[in-house]
């Protein structure tokens, strides 16, 4: 019994005087305890507690139930205590099922022992399966068995406290161990969209997907810069074991421009926390932005291909879409795509494919693109570039050489005179007049340009080269003249000079 | 069929002359140009200069007057080159090449087969 | 002094088309002229005029010109078009010749 000094407050004594006590099924449990501020008698095994004022605790037939721990308190709330064993070879572990372990802690298996002196005390699993090899465990026969640092695996393993009696195994009723898991990763949140584009009116409907080890993790829909609540509907399902999902879908049901901005997805659990936005944007009405992925001025060679290709934006979807020359629509040559197949995507190319371009077919290119709230349009200014072509080479009645040629860009015309007894000539020829004609075709068309030279400066028998070039090529044309007495012979103008 | 044949592979020490000569046969020989063209060994073409072979005035590029002679001989329809004073550097092919045409529209149509001269001391 | 600049060198798979350029400030006026040379060393003018066959060359040699940069495509190649090949063109008030410095053409 506890000693104290004089004139301090002591525990109160309990009779008999053990720590624990045995006594058999049916026997008689008689426990005294003495204390001049005696205040109750509390008896307490797994989740049952029972109170007694009477100084004395008298249980005439005890039962395996009985078996718990028996206190003494007075009105110091100074306390004593005694374990009973009620020793039933019936009845050799009183246990409470549910059994329940955060991973990484101890939980305890509670199947305490009616009777201390059977052996080897200790975890089994179920139908004779042996336990996980890292499962470790610390027996008490108060209290039951300790299994130290609970891991994930153990989830829903099936055990049993065991005794040997007799030389016998004896098993209790069986456990099954739920364990709860430790948030060891921030929960895993996704948006079903990143970004909305809506027009005024239009329902906002976003779902946000939370996923993590247990329900247990947090979650909200918050409003950046914003401390409103927001209006949210969930669902959730276990996927298995630690394999937790929850929706959380906000809406807003007729959204308004000022409605725009960021939305977050916020979760957090013990372990940190992990956040997902989209973007909201709301317009007043529909719009289309065109972009020329090209020059809109275009040169191209004769004869050869140009593509014109624009990307634009359309919101809502394009509805009509278009490319136009002189009036003219184009059924085919060009195609019209969406740039992404991402279900958000406003973003769109269109493609017209101009193949083998004659000099005629310059001019303006217009894409056409509506919905059902804008059109837009963009135009392109194609110019062929040709090969200068001679349209005229004569001699005119004042004695002039003339040579007409056409092309784009505009051609420059040489002039070279060889006599007759030359083989090879370098002498170029200035000329007395040149101009730049005015076009009767289109804009965009060729131009043309009319070089002069006086073959009165010509003494002697010979050719006469006009030769007119530019960017894309060359083309010549040939005089050839002869002296007959003092008059010049009527010139023969010839395309080919062949050697 | 038109032919230009040339004379065969010489051997000449620095300082000393070379006469090549272009035969041409199957063509009026007055009525085209005569071109003359270089080559070193492992090099590329390089232009000399031609003769008028109506009135047999020669026109010379700027690296090839000087030692450098064309000549004609008409009555054979034979173009003749002569290089004097030979150095290491006029070790080449030279070949022979007939022309028509104005300004820049010609084309040297006929080759010889190229003669050979090395100068080596 | 002038120059017509031509890759040293460029190969072609039998059968393909293959595109050998020169590049000239007077090509844009002046008319280019391609040769070949085989290694036998014999030499044939395949196109004259930027786009002109002699007669007797085949009709897989084309030619063209723009800009400054003038262009001999062979189609179909074969085996016997393995060569050097030389632009010429002119250049100055006098217009003197001047070869490019070839292109040396290996067919794979």
């Known amino acids: 019994q506890p000693s104290v000094s004089p004139g301090e407050p002591s525990p109160p004594s309990i009779h008999p005087g053990k720590s624990d006590l045995i006594v058999r099924v049916g026997d008689e449990i008689r426990l005294l305890c003495t204390d001049p501020g005696f205040v109750k008698w509390t008896f307490e095994i797994l989740d049952e507690t029972n109170e007694n004022k009477q100084n004395e605790w008298i249980t005439e037939k005890a039962e395996a139930t009985n078996t718990g721990k028996y206190t003494c308190t007075n009105k110091h709330g100074l306390s004593n205590s005694i374990y009973v064993f009620v020793r039933d070879p019936a009845k050799l572990f009183l246990v409470d099922r549910s059994l329940y372990g955060k991973e990484d802690n101890d939980t305890l298996v509670r199947c305490p022992l009616t009777d201390p002196e059977v052996t080897n005390y200790s975890l089994k699993g179920c139908q004779g399966k042996p336990l996980p090899k890292d499962l470790r465990f610390i027996p008490d026969p108060k209290a039951g068995i300790m299994i130290k640092s609970v891991k994930r695996a153990y989830h829903r393993l099936c055990l049993h406290c065991s005794v040997d009696q007799e030389g016998k195994s004896v098993l209790s009723e069986k456990f099954i161990l739920k364990v709860r898991p430790a948030f060891k990763a921030v929960p895993v949140v996704s948006v079903s969209k990143a970004s909305y584009l809506l027009r005024e009116g239009e329902e906002f409907t976003v779902t946000c997907t939370i996923k993590d080890v247990s329900s247990s993790v947090y979650s909200t829909w918050k409003r950046e810069n914003s401390q409103t609540k927001l209006q949210e509907k969930y669902n959730s399902w276990h996927h298995g074991d630690f394999n937790y999902e929850r929706q959380a879908t906000l809406t807003i049901s007729s959204a308004r421009v000022n409605d725009s901005g960021v939305f977050m997805c916020y979760a957090n659990n013990t372990f940190g926390s992990a956040n997902v936005t989209t973007t909201l944007e709301v317009v007043d009405k529909g719009f289309i932005n065109i972009f020329p992925m090209i020059n809109t001025t275009v040169f191209v060679n004769d004869g050869e291909n140009v593509d014109l290709i624009v990307e634009y934006e359309a919101f809502p979807k394009p509805e009509h879409q278009q490319w136009i020359y002189m009036n003219r629509t184009f059924t085919d040559k060009w195609e019209d795509y969406p740039k992404s197949e991402n279900e958000s995507n406003i973003r769109y190319v269109s493609e017209l494919h101009l193949t083998r371009l004659k000099g005629t077919e310059g001019g303006t290119y217009t894409f056409l693109v509506s919905n059902s709230d804008v059109n837009a349009a963009i135009a392109f200014n194609v110019y062929v570039n040709t090969k200068p072509e001679i349209l005229t080479y004569d001699r005119l009645v004042n004695g002039m050489l003339q040579c007409v040629a056409a092309g784009f860009p505009e051609p420059t015309i040489d002039w070279y005179f060889c006599p007759g007894t030359e083989q090879r000539c370098s002498a170029s020829v200035l000329p007395v007049d040149v101009q730049t004609l005015n076009s009767s075709g289109p804009p965009f068309g060729k131009l043309v340009v009319q070089s002069s030279i006086d073959s009165s400066a010509f003494k002697h028998n010979g050719t006469v080269e006009c030769k007119a070039y530019n960017d894309v090529g060359k083309t010549s044309a040939y005089f050839n003249f002869a002296f007959k007495g003092n008059n010049k012979e009527q010139i023969h103008p010839h395309t080919l000079f062949t050697p | 069929q038109i032919q230009l044949v040339q004379s065969g592979p010489e051997l000449r020490k620095p300082g000393e002359s070379v006469k090549i000569s272009c035969k041409a046969s199957?063509?009026?020989?007055?009525?085209?140009?005569m071109y003359w063209v270089k080559q070193a060994p492992g090099k590329g073409l390089k232009w000399m200069g031609w003769?008028?072979?109506?009135?047999?005035?020669?026109t010379y590029a700027d690296d090839f007057k000087g030692r450098f002679v064309f000549s004609l001989e008409a009555s054979a329809n034979t173009a003749n080159l002569q290089i004097s004073n030979l150095k290491n550097e006029d070790t080449a092919t030279y070949f022979c090449a007939r022309a028509r045409g104005l300004v820049d529209d010609y084309v040297m149509d006929a080759w010889g087969q190229g003669t050979s001269v090395t100068v080596s001391s | 002094s002038y120059e017509l600049i031509q890759p040293p060198s460029a190969s072609v798979t039998l059968g393909n088309t293959v595109s050998l350029t020169c590049v000239g400030d007077?090509?844009?006026?002046?008319?280019a002229q391609w040769y070949q040379q085989k290694p036998d060393k014999t030499i044939v003018s395949v196109i004259y005029k930027d786009s002109e066959r002699p007669s007797g060359i085949s009709d897989r040699f084309s030619g063209s010109s723009s800009g400054t940069t003038a262009t001999l495509t062979i189609h179909g190649t074969l085996a016997e078009d393995e060569a050097d090949y030389y632009c010429?063109?002119?250049?100055?008030?006098?217009?003197?010749?001047?070869f490019g410095g070839g292109t040396k053409l290996t067919v794979l």
């Open positions: 007077e090509l844009s006026k002046r008319y």
């Open positions: 003769i008028n072979t109506y009135t047999g005035k020669p």
């Open positions: 199957g063509y009026t020989f007055t009525d085209y140009a």
């Open positions: 010429l063109s002119t250049y100055s008030d006098d217009n003197l010749p001047v």
